[in-house]
C-alpha cells in the first residue's frame, strides 16, 4: 500500500491559490485576510510516472482525501497515531517503483451550494522502493507551504521492490520453511528442495540403496542393510561367504559349496592327524592321514608300541601293558597321562581369609594386608609400610594399626587437614584453612586478624587545597572548597572547559567564574549576540564581495567584512556590474564551490572494489579477498597454514583449497570420515558431503565454493539515490552519500541552512547542497550583510 501523511501547513495569510481569502474580505489597512481561517483538507492522486506531469487524467494507482485537519497553519509532526492526516492507497498490482503524485490542499466551504476551493497544489514524480522508512517531501512555492511524507509498504507475506514475490512460512506435510528478508524460502533443519518438503537423510546414507521420508532417517532398499544401507544382504544360510550384490554367497578362501559351508582345507582347519601323521585334503570336508611307523587308525591315533611316543607327561614313567601303557606319575600329578595337577588347595589351609594358589605338589597363600606367614596365621606389622602421614607415632595392633596425629590433622592415616574455618572472619572476608589454624583474607577497606577493623583511608591526609576528608569503606571522599575540584581537590575549576565562549572569543578563567573577550562583531556574556553596527556606524558596499564598516579596532578606522557566499570551500572574487565568481579550493567546483569533484570517475578500484569519493581523494572498499589502495592484491588465505595432516594449501579469492593426503578429508583435511563440519561453509551455507569433495548450498546474497563471496545483488539496481555509492554488506547494503544528501538511501537533502547563514533576519532557502538568502527589506548581498 502507498501511504501519505500530512506533516505541516503554512498559509500565513489564509489565502487561496487564486489570491482570494479563504473566508471573508481583506483588511483595507494591511491587506491581510480577516474573519475565519481556511478549513484545510488534502486530496491525493497517484498515477503512473510522468516526466511532464499532467493534472488531468485518471489516478490510475488510486486516489483519496483527508477530512479537514486544520486551519491556515498547523504542525502535525508530533501527533503520531492520528489517522486523520493519513491517506492509505492500497494496490493489488505489482508496485512499479516509479510514480507521479499530485497533492492538493483545499479549503472546505462547509456549504452545499458553495464549492470547495483549492489552496495549493504540489506534484512529484519519482521512484520509491517498499520500506518502513518515510520519505519527506515539501511544497515550498505559492501561497501556502506544506510538508508531507510518503512510503510504500508490502502486505504481509509479500516481498521485493514490486511487492509481488509471495512467501508465507509453513511447517507441515506440504513444506517446512521460513522466509528470508527477500521472500526466498529457507528450509528448516532437516529439509531440502524448492518447497522444503524433501527430507535430508542421515549423513552417509547411500544415495543409491537408501532413502528417507523423515530427516535423519536411512531406509534400505530390498537386499541392503546397515546404518547407511551400504551393506548387501548375502544369500540366506551363507556360512563362510560374503556378497558384493544382494543375495550372493561368494566363498571365503578354503570354503566351497552353494552356501560356502564345505571345508576345502579340512587338514588346515581341524589338523586331525595325530602322532606326526601327514594330512592330505581329498575333497570338500574329506581328508586322509598317512601315519608314521608304529601308528595306525584313520587319525593315526592307535600306537602299536605304546610307550614309544612318551605318553606320560610331567616326568611320569611309562610301562607297556597288554591294553597299551600305564603311567606312574611324579609327586603332584595324576591322571592316565600324568597331565592333571593335584589340587593342593583342597582343603584350603589359608587362615584369616587368605587366598590359596595351587602349585605343583604344594600351595601358596595370598594374605590380606593385616596377616602374614605360610598360612596367614601371623599378625603383620602395618607400621613397617609407614602409613601415618602427619603423625607423632604409629602403633601396631592385631590386624590393624593406630596413627597418633599431629595437631590440625585427622583420619586413619592423619592425612586429612582439620578445617579450622568456622566463621571467624568478618565483613565478607574469605577464610583460608591452614594446618592447625586459619587466615582471614580481608576485602578491600578492612584489616585485623578477623577483618574486624575498617581501615581509615583519611589517615594519610590525601585531600589537597583545604579539602575535608571523609572516611568510607575502602575509599575516601574529598569535600572541596569553592574553586577546586577533582578526587583530591587538586584541580582549580576551569570554567573555560568546555569553552562557553562563542564565535571564536577567547575565554579567561577566574576564581569562580569566566570572562569572554568578544571579537568586534559580537557581544553578550558568551559573545553570542551579533552587534548591530548599523545603530552606530553606517556600512559601505565596496564591491560584490566586501562591505566596509567604521571601526575603532583598525588603524584606518575602517573594517572590511568579506561575503561567505562561496561557502567553506571557496573565496569570493568581485566582478564588474555587481557580479562575483568563486575561486574553489582543490577538489571542489560549481558556482558556489558546493560540489565535490567526483574523484571516482576513472574507476580506479579493481577486482570489484567500490570507490568512495572524498575531497580531492578517493578510497577503495575492496571486495572480500582483495586488499591494497586499488584492491589490486589477492589476500593470501594460506598464510595461516589452514591445511592439517600434511595437506597442501592453494590460495583462491577470499578462500583456499586444501589438497589432502593419506585419506584425510574436509575443508582443512581435519577429518577421517566426513567432508563437512560447521565451519566448512561460511555465512549460513549448508554443507553436503559428496564422498571425495564437499558442496556448499549458499543462502541469498552469497556465492563461491564456501559461500565466501558476497553477491552484488543487494546493490543491483543501485538503491542509493542522488549519486550515492552502494557498498555490498552481506545480504544487505550501505549507502555512502554524496555531499548534501543523507539518510539510509541518500534520499534526504541535508539542511544547508543550518546553522543560519543569512544575516539581518534574511530567510534561508535550502537547495540540493546549496542555499540562497532572501533578504529582509533594506538588506542585500549573498548573505544579506
Amino acid at each position: 500500500q502507498f501511504e501519505l501523511e500530512i506533516l505541516s501547513m503554512q498559509n500565513v495569510n489564509g489565502e487561496l491559490q487564486n489570491g482570494n481569502c479563504c473566508g471573508g474580505a481583506r483588511n483595507p489597512g494591511d491587506r491581510k485576510c480577516t474573519r475565519d481561517e481556511c478549513d484545510t483538507y488534502f486530496k491525493v492522486c497517484l498515477k503512473e510516472y510522468q516526466s511532464r506531469v499532467t493534472a488531468g487524467g485518471p489516478c490510475s494507482f488510486g486516489s483519496g482525501s483527508t477530512p479537514v485537519i486544520g486551519g491556515n497553519t498547523f504542525n502535525l509532526k508530533a501527533s503520531r497515531g492520528n489517522d486523520r492526516n493519513r491517506i492509505v492507497l492500497p494496490f493489488s498490482f505489482a508496485w512499479p517503483r516509479s510514480y507521479t503524485l499530485l497533492v492538493e490542499a483545499w479549503d472546505s466551504s462547509n456549504d452545499t451550494v458553495q464549492p470547495d476551493s483549492i489552496i495549493e497544489k504540489a506534484s512529484h514524480s519519482g521512484m520509491i522502493n517498499p520500506s518502513r522508512q518515510w520519505q519527506t517531501l515539501k511544497q515550498n512555492t505559492g501561497v501556502a507551504h506544506f510538508e508531507y511524507q510518503i512510503r510504500v509498504t508490502c502486505d504481509d507475506y509479500y516481498y521485493g521492490f514490486g511487492c509481488n514475490k509471495f512467501c508465507r512460512p509453513r511447517d507441515d506435510f506440504f513444506g517446512h520453511y521460513a522466509c528470508d528478508q527477500n521472500g526466498n524460502k529457507t528450509c528448516m533443519e532437516g529439509w531440502m528442495g524448492p518447497e522444503c518438503n524433501r527430507a535430508i537423510c542421515r549423513q552417509g546414507c547411500s544415495p543409491k540403496h537408501g532413502s528417507c521420508k523423515l530427516p535423519g532417517d536411512c531406509r534400505c532398499q530390498y537386499g541392503w542393510q546397515g546404518l547407511y544401507c551400504d551393506k548387501c544382504i548375502p544369500h540366506p544360510g551363507c556360512v563362510h561367504g560374503i556378497c558384493n550384490e544382494p543375495w550372493q554367497c561368494l566363498c571365503e578362501t578354503n570354503w566351497g559349496g552353494q552356501l560356502c559351508d564345505k571345508d576345502l582345507n579340512y587338514c588346515g582347519t581341524h589338523q586331525p592327524c595325530l602322532n606326526g601323521g601327514t594330512c592330505s585334503n581329498t575333497g570338500p570336508d574329506k581328508y586322509q592321514c598317512s601315519c608314521p611307523e608304529g601308528y595306525s587308525g584313520p587319525n593315526c591315533e592307535i600306537a602299536e608300541h605304546a610307550c614309544l611316543s612318551d605318553p606320560c607327561h610331567n616326568r611320569g614313567s611309562c610301562k607297556e601293558t597288554s591294553l597299551g601303557f600305564e603311567c606312574e606319575c611324579s609327586p603332584g600329578w595324576t591322571g592316565p597321562t600324568c597331565s592333571t595337577n593335584i589340587d593342593d588347595c583342597s582343603p584350603n589351609n589359608c587362615s584369616h581369609g587368605g587366598t590359596c594358589q595351587d602349585l605343583v605338589n604344594g600351595f601358596k597363600c595370598v594374605c590380606p594386608p593385616q596377616w602374614t606367614g605360610k598360612t596367614c596365621q601371623l599378625d603383620a606389622n602395618e607400621c613397617e609400610a609407614k602409613p601415618c602421614v602427619n603423625a607423632k607415632s604409629c602403633k601396631n595392633l592385631i590386624a590393624s594399626y593406630y596413627c597418633d596425629c599431629l595437631p590440625g590433622w585427622m583420619g586413619q592415616n592423619c592425612d586429612i587437614n582439620i578445617n579450622d574455618c568456622l566463621g571467624q572472619c568478618q565483613n565478607d572476608a574469605s577464610c583460608r584453612d591452614l594446618v592447625n589454624g586459619y587466615r582471614c583474607i580481608c576485602p578491600p577497606g578492612y584489616a585485623g586478624d578477623h577483618c574486624e577493623r575498617d581501615i581509615d583511608e583519611c589517615a594519610s591526609n590525601p585531600c589537597l587545597n583545604g579539602g575535608h576528608c571523609q572516611n568510607e569503606i575502602n575509599r575516601f571522599q574529598c569535600l572541596c572548597p569553592t574553586g577546586f575540584s577533582g578526587n583530591l581537590c587538586q584541580l582549580d575549576i576551569d570554567y573555560c572547559e568546555p569553552n562557553p565562549c562563542q564565535n571564536g572569543a577567547q575565554c579567561y578563567n577566574r576564581a569562580s567564574d569566566y570572562f569572554c573577550k568578544c571579537p568586534e562583531d559580537y557581544e553578550g556574556k558568551n559573545c553570542s549576540h551579533l552587534k548591530d553596527h548599523c545603530r552606530t556606524t553606517p556600512c559601505e558596499v565596496i564591491d560584490s564581495c566586501t562591505v566596509a564598516m567604521a571601526s575603532n579596532d583598525t588603524p584606518e578606522g575602517v573594517r572590511y567584512i568579506s561575503s561567505n557566499v562561496c561557502g567553506p570551500h571557496g573565496k569570493c572574487k568581485s566582478q564588474s556590474g555587481g557580479k562575483f565568481t568563486c575561486d574553489c579550493n582543490k577538489g571542489f567546483t560549481g558556482t558556489y564551490c558546493h560540489e565535490n569533484i567526483n574523484d571516482c570517475e576513472s574507476n580506479p578500484c579493481r577486482n570489484g572494489g567500490t570507490c568512495i569519493d572524498g575531497v580531492n581523494s578517493y578510497k577503495c572498499i575492496c571486495s572480500d579477498g582483495w586488499e591494497g589502495a586499488y584492491c589490486e592484491t589477492n589476500i593470501n588465505d594460506c598464510s595461516q597454514n589452514p591445511c592439517h595432516n600434511g595437506g597442501t594449501c592453494r590460495d583462491l579469492v577470499n578462500d583456499f583449497y586444501c589438497d589432502c593426503k593419506n585419506g584425510w578429508k574436509g575443508k582443512t583435511c581435519h577429518s577421517r570420515d566426513s567432508q563437512c563440519d560447521e565451519a566448512t561453509c561460511n555465512n549460513g551455507g549448508t554443507c553436503y558431503d559428496e564422498g571425495d569433495a564437499f558442496k556448499c548450498m549458499c543462502p541469498g546474497g552469497w556465492e563461491g565454493t564456501t559461500c565466501n563471496i558476497a553477491r552484488n545483488s543487494s546493490c543491483l539496481p543501485n538503491p542509493c539515490h542522488n549519486g550515492g555509492t552502494c557498498v555490498v554488506n552481506g545480504e544487505s547494503f550501505t549507502c555512502v552519500c554524496k555531499e548534501g544528501w543523507e539518510g539510509p538511501i541518500c534520499a534526504q537533502n541535508t539542511n544547508d541552512c543550518s546553522p543560519h547563514p543569512c544575516y539581518n533576519s534574511g530567510t534561508c532557502v535550502d537547495g540540493d547542497n546549496w542555499y540562497r538568502c532572501e533578504c529582509a527589506p533594506g538588506f542585500a548581498g549573498p548573505d544579506c550583510r
Partner: antibody, heavy 119, light 110 residues
C-alpha cells in the same frame, strides 16, 4: 464464502467407471486445493488424493493409484473424481473437500455423492 | 497400512467430560499436526480441532485437543446431547505419502 456442490447419486456395475463432479463457488478453483475422501457403509473416512499446493500437482493415495484420476476444469470451476474397475467394495459416500489455504486440514466439505456398485 | 488407532466407542452423561484418544507413529502424529473431524448422522464431516489444539471459529470452547509424542486426544468437557456423533482424528503420513484417518469413535450421550 466457499461452497462445494457435488453431482447426484450413481449406480454402476462391477468393472465399470464412475465420474463424480464438485462445483466450486465463492472462490475460483485455481485459488483452492481440492481433495477427495470416501466413507463406505459402516466404515471410517478414507483419503483418496488431492492437489498439493506447494508442488502444484495432484497426489494419490497408494491404494487407489492405479485406478483413480482427479482432474480440474478451471473454466467452469469444477473438480472431477474418476474411479475405474469398480467392485462392490467401492460402494461409498464420496466427498470433495478444500484444504485450508495455509494448513493441512479440510475446512469446507461437499454434501457427498453416494456411489453404489451392484450387478 | 496401519493407520491411526481410535477406540470404537465412547460415552458419557450430559455435563460430563469425555476424552477420545488417537495413537499413531513417528511418521504421522510424531512428525505432523493432528486434526479432528465430527460427523453428525446424515451430514458431511466438520472440522472441530486443527493443528493439535486450535479451534475453528463457531466451534464451542468445550472442544479441546492436545498432542504428545505419537498420540493425540480430543476432550469434550460439559458434554451435550448435540455432541452425539462420530469423531475422526487425521494426520498426514510421510511413509504413506498421504493423509491417514483414525477408524472413528462413536460418541453416545447417555
Amino acid at each position: 464464502q466457499v461452497q462445494l456442490v457435488q453431482s447426484g447419486a450413481e449406480v454402476q456395475k462391477p468393472g465399470a467407471s464412475v465420474k463424480v463432479s464438485c462445483k466450486v463457488s465463492g472462490y475460483t478453483l485455481s485459488e483452492l486445493s481440492i481433495h477427495w475422501v470416501r466413507q463406505a457403509p459402516g466404515k471410517g473416512l478414507e483419503w483418496m488424493g488431492g492437489f498439493d499446493p506447494e508442488d502444484g500437482k495432484i497426489v494419490y493415495a497408494q491404494k487407489f493409484q492405479d485406478r483413480v484420476s482427479m482432474t480440474q476444469d478451471t473454466s467452469t470451476d469444477t473438480a472431477y473424481l474418476q474411479l475405474s474397475s469398480l467392485t462392490s467394495g467401492d460402494t461409498a459416500l464420496y466427498y470433495c473437500a478444500t484444504l485450508a489455504q495455509w494448513g493441512d486440514w479440510f475446512d469446507r466439505w461437499g454434501q457427498g455423492t453416494l456411489v453404489t456398485v451392484s450387478s | 497400512q496401519a493407520g491411526l488407532t481410535q477406540p470404537p466407542s465412547a460415552s458419557g452423561t450430559p455435563g460430563q467430560r469425555v476424552t477420545i484418544s488417537c495413537s499413531g507413529s513417528s511418521s504421522n502424529i510424531g512428525s505432523n499436526t493432528v486434526n479432528w473431524y465430527q460427523r453428525l448422522p446424515g451430514t458431511a464431516p466438520k472440522l472441530v480441532v486443527y493443528s493439535n489444539n486450535q479451534r475453528p471459529s463457531g466451534v464451542p470452547d468445550r472442544f479441546s485437543g492436545s498432542k504428545s509424542g505419537t498420540s493425540a486426544s480430543l476432550v469434550i468437557s460439559g458434554l451435550q446431547s448435540e455432541d452425539e456423533a462420530d469423531y475422526y482424528c487425521a494426520a498426514w503420513d510421510y511413509d504413506e505419502e498421504g493423509l491417514l484417518f483414525g477408524g472413528g469413535t462413536q460418541l453416545t450421550v447417555l
